[in-house]
Interface confidence: low
Amino acid sequence: QLTIESRPFNVAEGKEVLLLAHNVSQNLFGYIWYKGERVDASRRIGSCVIRTQQITPGPAHSGRETIDFNASLLIQNVTQSDTGSYTIQVIKEDLVNEEATGQFRVYPELPKPYITSNNSNPIEDKDAVALTCEPETQDTTYLWWVNNQSLPVSPRLELSSDNRTLTVFNIPRNDTTSYKCETQNPVSVRRSDPVTLNVLYGPDAPTISPLNTPYRAGEYLNLTCHAASNPTAQYFWFVNGTFQQSTQELFIPNITVNNSGSYMCQAHNSATGLNRTTVTAITVYAELPKPYITSNNSNPIEDKDAVTLTCEPETQDTTYLWWVNNQRLSVSSRLELSNDNRTLTVFNIPRNDTTFYECETQNPVSVRRSDPVTLNVLYGPDAPTISPLNTPYRAGENLNLSCHAASNPAAQYFWFVNGTFQQSTQELFIPNITVNNSGSYMCQAHNSATGLNRTTVTAITVYVELPKPYISSNNSNPIEDKDAVTLTCEPVAENTTYLWWVNNQSLSVSPRLQLSNGNRILTLLSVTRNDTGPYECGIQNSESAKRSDPVTLNVTYGPDTPIISPPDLSYRSGANLNLSCHSDSNPSPQYSWLINGTLRQHTQVLFISKITSNNNGAYACFVSNLATGRNNSIVKNISVSSGDSAPGSSGLSASGSGSGLNDIFEAQKIEWHHHHHH
């Protein structure tokens, strides 16, 4: 069966609609579209002949219709007058006609709705507000949204019969509910912008902040008044009933006690016409100055004077407290407070009382503490002490006495020796004292504040210390086996014992060592080279003992018989001759070499290179000690051979006491001495 489908059925104004014929026969001659529910030539839109592909518009063609060969009708830019029925007449090739009718509806596209109100500024819990969704349009459904939710059931909300008006009752303050209305028709859905209600309220009773009374003088006072109100309240400040200013904040810089009083804030709502007030009391206190302590006696005498300490200055509304050594004042028989706590009396103050006193003042805005005060307790002088007490003193030492007496203020000191004033210093210094400095030493201590004097006496004894002894000798350079030496311990001292040490050992008596003159003189008979010492003497008495520096004797001896080395007597020709001579002697001897009686040189060593047979002969080493005046010598006969020969050893010695060599030496003496001294 032939049917017509409208795509879409509901068409928005200005859009297009497509009418489609369904179940169209196969063998078509053509078809005609009509406006309306029947075939009416006057309402023909257009026709189509399939075979010729010819489309002919009819009287009802508006220029917006398009007929297609597939039996569809497209109408563009539809208007509300296009609403209705449309009929298609299908002409088959056998000229049998078939008809079908379809329809569609055209609706306007809805505008965006908006909400109007009969009261934009309702008063809280009092006014009802009627919200109306505009504009009013036909075929439109109205809906409401509250806070983006569909309209809830509530006694506070009431809809009109057409849903276009929503009445809101009993609106609370701070109602932030969002209201929107929605319009609907078959072709569109539109929603309004949200509307919230500006609920008028207040003012409530204002609050004043901050409430941090009491205030300090010199601070600023900054009070803020706030009252819940819509519209915002206007504020008025009154101080002690007098209008000050119409601001929300009241600011008074650098307040004084005169700014104390009753501060009232009045809040006014110009919309509701209501006023509310709040009062606060402000108290301003002066910041206390730093207190200080005065005393009726800054310098009390120990265990005698009472001292009254007063906390200054005296100020109103002030609490006074006392601190003793950083502790709150505790009950004591030595401390007494006045009724107002401003005065503290201290009794029986001991010396060296280091207690420190502080007073504290308090009011509601400040706590101040004074600097500490200590009492300068006068005392003394006590009996002075003299130090050090290391009598007896040695003559020649320094006497350095110090006097000290406990005293406040510090004592002045005066020294008297055997009753005679010496000096006014704390220390008495006498350099290089003698026995004449023995005596009675008195120190007087004077306190010019208390006017008191105290003295102490000490006896000083000075003794003569033994001098350090020394050894004198009658002969510092004795000759061995010839001289006797007398060592004397100096000086001569009375009541003194003399002692001797030799080689750090106490002297042991022997036939060659003799003591005399109360052991003060030590005689060495016929000294030997082993008697060099060292020698020390000591003196001692009941006070002291002293020992001399060591003394050594320079015992001159020798020269002993010299020794020539090496001992060889025979040498090969061409060899080097290297002879060395040595003799024990003090002082060291002088060495001379003679060859075959002729003086060759004054050395200890004789060296001849590449000797020949001409070097055969008597080689004499001559030693001389000018201190002892003694000489000695030795002769070695040297033979030089051209061939190998066994070395031999032989030597002839000659001492200074006389030998065959002496004649040779005598002959050389003038030349030798001349050479020696140049």
């Epitope: 800054s298 310098n299 350095n400 203020p409 510090a410 004592a411 002045q412 000191y413 000096q423 006014s424 210093t425 704390q426 220390e427 008495l428 210094f429 006498i430 350099p431 010019s448 504040a449």
Partner: antibody
Framework: EVQLVESGGGLVKPGGSLKLSCAAS????????MSWVRQTPEKRLEWVAF????????YYADTVKGRFTISRDNAKNTLYLQMSSLKSEDTAMFYC?????????????WGQGTLVTVSA | DIQMTQSPASLSASVGETVTITCRAS??????FAWYQQKQGKSPQLLVY???ILAEGVPSRFSGSGSGTQFSLKINSLQPEDFGTYYC?????????FGSGTKLELK
């Protein structure tokens, strides 16, 4: 005759150092406590430092504490003042003085002074 | 510290006159008090100590008095050599402090 002779003064830059000496004669130096006293260009007298007769005790004015050191050598009969971290306000004539009575006595003998100038 | 307040700062007088200089201590110093004389280009010299004791060699026309906080120096029959600057000082312990000085000038 008592004599105190100061030496060692001169021109020094701020922050610099100087050592003053005071040679004593004519009295038993080791018996006396000694002080240094200075006189500012405005003629104000200021006590600077103190030392006891054997050097066991020393004291200083607050203005010089930590910067100046007083010492003595009794064997040489000499008093010293070592000055460091000098400031322009240290410019003065420096005198050494011997005390009666120590810390409770006056300045009995004075030297002739030595001038210290602290300037950039 | 103890402050010494000396007055007058300067004083003009003629030879033969009598003058008095005063000094006040900020606290009780008993008799720990001295006077010094300083002449132009010279070092100070001790005149009086312990408030009233004349130092060695000081002429008897000088006299010191006072105790506690008030002190004075009196010079009878001024002599030409007495002109100069006078300083007061406490010797009541460390720190020692001086007055600011009194300049005595010839009128």
């Amino acid at each position: 005759e008592v004599q105190l002779v100061e030496s060692g003064g001169g021109l020094v830059k701020p922050g610099g150092s100087l050592k003053l000496s005071c040679a004593a004669s004519g009295f038993t130096f080791s018996s006396y406590d000694m002080s240094w006293v200075r006189q500012t260009p405005e003629k104000r007298l200021e006590w600077v430092a103190f030392i006891s007769s054997y050097g066991g005790r020393t004291y200083y004015a607050d203005t010089v504490k930590g910067r100046f050191t007083i010492s003595r050598d009794n064997a040489k009969n000499t008093l010293y003042l070592q000055m460091s971290s000098l400031k322009s306000e240290d410019t003065a004539m420096f005198y050494c003085a011997a005390h009666y009575f120590g810390t409770s006595g006056p300045f009995a003998y004075w030297g002739q002074g030595t001038l210290v100038t602290v300037s950039a | 510290d103890i402050q010494m307040t000396q007055s007058p700062a300067s004083l003009s007088a003629s030879v033969g006159e009598t003058v008095t200089i005063t000094c006040r201590a900020s606290e009780n110093i008993y008799s720990y008090f001295a006077w010094y004389q300083q002449k132009q280009g010279k070092s100070p010299q001790l005149l009086v100590y312990n408030a009233k004791i004349l130092a060695e060699g000081v002429p008897s026309r000088f006299s010191g008095s006072g105790s506690g906080t008030q002190f004075s120096l009196k010079i009878n029959s001024l002599q030409p050599e007495d002109f100069g600057t006078y300083y007061c000082q406490h010797h009541y312990g460390i720190p020692f402090t001086f007055g600011s000085g009194t300049k005595l000038e010839l009128k």
